[in-house]
Amino acid sequence: QRLSRAQQQLPLESLGWDIAELQLNHTGPQQDPRLYWQGGPALGRSFLRGPELDKGQLRIRRDGIYMVHIQVTLAICSSTSTSRHHHPTTLAVGICSPASRSISLLRLSFHQGCTIASQRLTPLARGDTLCTNLTGTLLPSRNTDETFFGVQWVRP
């Protein structure tokens, strides 16, 4: 669609084109399966334009339909370590707060590989906080070309 002259003068954020691409900061302490993310030009090729980080978790600031994508590569990994553990070795992306909107959006299993990646379109609302839970005793790589997480506003 064509933008009006007035719209062309506005910053992208005001048009609703919120977007973020994050890199892994660290994993959580014991009993906390969450991955903690970071973003910003000083860190390399990660950024936040609209969404924000709240204690390492991504918070949405604008309603809309978003493309959510994630890739996680394990730094300590073998075909046996990703299949023999008693606990399921899965990566789940979901809305973790507010509690009233809590829901799983993506769930992936490592099976016998060291990398998993997926994406989906989903409606998100202002204030939704996305959590990425890595269950099982697995240590993700912090290499920025191996592990990353992002969202892109697509339409209202």
Epitope: H26, T27, G28, Q31, A75, C77, S78, C114, T137, L139
Partner: antibody, heavy 120, light 108 residues
Framework: EVQLLESGGGVVQPGRSLRLSCAAS????????MSWVRQAPGKCLEWVSA????????FYAESVEGRFTISRDNSKNTLYLQMNSLRAEDTAVYYC?????????????WGQGTLVTVSS | EIVLTQSPGTLSLSPGERATLSCRAS???????LAWYQQKPGQAPRLLIY???SRATGIPDRFSGSGSGTDFTLTINRLEPEDFAVYYC?????????FGCGTKVDIK
């Protein structure tokens, strides 16, 4: 300057326990995964155990799983290895080693090691 | 687990010569995640090379790594007196991380 200083080694009888410590300085300790690597006299290096920067994720070699426990106290910048049910084949110099920032278990800094001798 | 075989066991050379050390893996090393270390008697290992070919901080450019898949090489051009030591390869692409048993480079 990154420094890793191991302590706690000594002579111990089979079946007994020992706790090793590694005091770290010169880097943000809580940001890095750490490992213990051992070297029996005249033998190869052997990775023993690893722990994530936060301490929430731990990993063990099959040879020590169920007997050794790795832990860390980030407030004290210290890494630990609790070794129970020690065997003669656990005799080695034990090194603590810092992982690269990527979390991958290759080691850009090592301590000088502490000798553990398991003998009756 | 991946077994790493280093050869030769001992390499006798003179200062100024080139050393070529081999490390062969029992299966392909994921993403060429292979490191080389130097160890002198009574000392801890020192990281030389990671990712098969990237030099660690402060390592002189006479040390170089190459190879992929299952065959890797550490080359030391123009051996200096301080280079006589034991060299270990280590793969870290698959758990558990494993080490070779070393190549000793000694003075002829």
């Amino acid at each position: 300057e990154v420094q890793l200083l191991e302590s706690g080694g000594g002579v111990v009888q089979p079946g007994r326990s020992l706790r090793l410590s590694c005091a770290a300085s010169g880097f943000t300790f809580s940001s890095y995964a750490m490992s213990w690597v051992r070297q029996a006299p005249g033998k190869c290096l052997e990775w023993v155990s690893a722990i994530s920067g936060s301490g929430g994720r731990t990993f063990y070699a099959e040879s020590v799983e169920g007997r050794f426990t790795i832990s860390r106290d980030n407030s004290k910048n210290t890494l630990y290895l609790q070794m129970n049910s020690l065997r003669a084949e656990d005799t080695a110099v034990y090194y603590c080693a810092k992982h690269d920032y990527s979390n991958y278990p290759y080691f850009d800094y090592w301590g000088q090691g502490t000798l553990v001798t398991v003998s009756s | 687990e991946i077994v790493l075989t280093q050869s030769p066991g001992t390499l006798s050379l003179s200062p100024g010569e080139r050393a070529t050390l081999s490390c062969r893996a029992s299966q392909s090393v994921r993403s060429n995640y292979l490191a080389w270390y130097q160890q002198k008697p009574g000392q801890a290992p020192r990281l030389l090379i990671y990712g098969a070919s990237s030099r660690a901080t402060g390592i002189p450019d006479r040390f170089s790594g190459s190879g992929s898949g299952t065959d890797f090489t550490l080359t030391i051009n123009r051996l200096e007196p301080e280079d006589f030591a034991v060299y270990y390869c280590q793969q870290y692409g698959s758990s558990p991380p494993t080490f070779g048993c070393g190549t000793k480079v000694d003075i002829k």
